[in-house]
């Protein structure tokens, strides 16, 4: 496990709960002390660890960006789960931001898939049925975006 990019805690916390490492590793929700003797609890709502580890620092909780909604909060064992707001989506190519879904398909195409938090609307050619990607130069019909149900954790 390699952890390089962790951000600062916002405030000091009281002494964390401790336990002993098992075979040099600490359980989820903890990090190891620098002398290797103790497992120190992560701080709820501030940092976390998801696996057995020898991290010297717990991982910093993600804060949902504007344009995202928090589906579940950060716990000591799980990062925050954020999802794009209704009418926006996060592409695999650019996961750092939510983009607005298109409101309709180009001429000669029909909508076969709704806007979801992880994908734009899906358009296919009326005749061939082949998919179209990219911005629509013209809109034939207005599509009401509908939010999807699955969520993805923030990266």
């Amino acid at each position: 496990i390699t952890q390089q990019d962790l951000a600062p805690q916002q405030r000091a916390a009281p002494q964390q709960k401790r336990s002993s490492p098992s075979e040099g590793l600490c359980p989820p929700g903890h990090h190891i002390s620098e002398d290797g003797r103790d497992c120190i609890s992560c701080k709820y709502g501030q940092d976390y660890s998801t696996h057995w580890n020898d991290l010297l620092f717990c991982l910093r909780c993600t804060r949902c960006d504007s344009g995202e909604v928090e589906l579940s909060p950060c716990t000591t064992t799980r990062n925050t789960v954020c999802q794009c707001e209704e009418g926006t989506f996060r592409e695999e190519d650019s996961p750092e931001m939510c983009r607005k879904c298109r409101t309709g398909c180009p001429r000669g195409m029909v909508k076969v898939g709704d806007c979801t938090p992880w994908s734009d609307i899906e358009c296919v050619h009326k005749e061939s049925g082949t998919k179209h990607s990219g911005e629509a130069p013209a809109v034939e019909e207005t599509v009401t975006s509908s939010p999807g149900t699955p969520a993805s954790p923030c990266s």
Partner: antibody
Framework: EVQLLESGGGLVQPGGSLRLSCAAS????????MSWVRQAPGKGLEWVSA????????YYADSVKGRFTISRDNSKNTLYLQMNSLRAEDTAVYYC??????????WGQGTLVTVSS | EIVLTQSPGTLSLSPGERATLSCRAS???????LAWYQQKPGQAPRLLIY???SRATGIPDRFSGSGSGTDFTLTISRLEPEDFAVYYC?????????FGQGTKVEIK
């Protein structure tokens, strides 16, 4: 008595590589997190990298990320810092230090790395 | 990252006087993760104080540390000739560990 002894420093051209070593004794090396800290001539202290006791977790300063690699051989009680793509601004005395978070309680004598053409 | 700002940059005092060095953090730091070091020319730093107020092994009791949150202080109650040096604070609350820029205590 805890002792940390660095070696491997020297003069290297920009873009070149060096590997620093730190031989540790006087404590249970494999239990402790270790760090490298550097000090440019006439400047203050800058933490460079750290590694957990088992070697499973590593940490780097942004200034060296992707160029430097910290590692350890617990069977030899030795800490390493592999430095690639060296730049003039990497010129410094490099110290091996015991600890990371609660203070560096023991330091080596330092080894000078000079990056110059 | 947490930025530590030390003041003053230089402190000019005479032996026997009291030295008060300040370290201010840009974000709150747990007392457990605040340390102070002394460094003399040509030497490696030496740990003086860890956990904001605990003296390291072999450190004379004229050195003391205090503070919490974002404000920490190193006090040398009566300066001895060997105390003239540069002093650094350091935090390990969150990565990367960072040092203050240092305070030089020089002979007046």
């Amino acid at each position: 008595e805890v002792q940390l002894l660095e070696s491997g420093g020297g003069l290297v051209q920009p873009g070149g590589s060096l590997r620093l070593s730190c031989a540790a004794s006087g404590f249970t090396f494999s239990s402790y997190a270790m760090s490298w800290v550097r000090q440019a001539p006439g400047k203050g202290l800058e933490w460079v990298s750290a590694i957990s006791g088992s070697g499973g977790s590593t940490y780097y300063a942004d200034s060296v990320k992707g160029r430097f690699t910290i590692s350890r051989d617990n069977s030899k009680n030795t800490l390493y810092l592999q430095m690639n793509s060296l730049r003039a601004e990497d010129t410094a005395v490099y110290y091996c230090a015991k600890g990371v978070r609660k203070g560096f309680d023991y330091w080596g004598q330092g080894t000078l790395v000079t990056v110059s053409s | 990252e947490i930025v530590l700002t030390q003041s003053p940059g230089t402190l000019s005092l005479s032996p026997g006087e009291r030295a008060t060095l300040s370290c201010r953090a840009s974000q709150s730091v747990s007392s457990s993760y605040l340390a102070w070091y002394q460094q003399k020319p040509g030497q490696a730093p030496r740990l003086l104080i860890y956990g904001a107020s605990s003296r390291a092994t072999g450190i004379p009791d004229r050195f003391s540390g205090s503070g919490s949150g974002t404000d920490f202080t190193l006090t040398i109650s009566r300066l001895e000739p060997e105390d003239f040096a540069v002093y650094y604070c350091q935090q390990g609350e969150s990565p990367p560990p960072t040092f203050g820029q240092g305070t030089k205590v020089e002979i007046k």
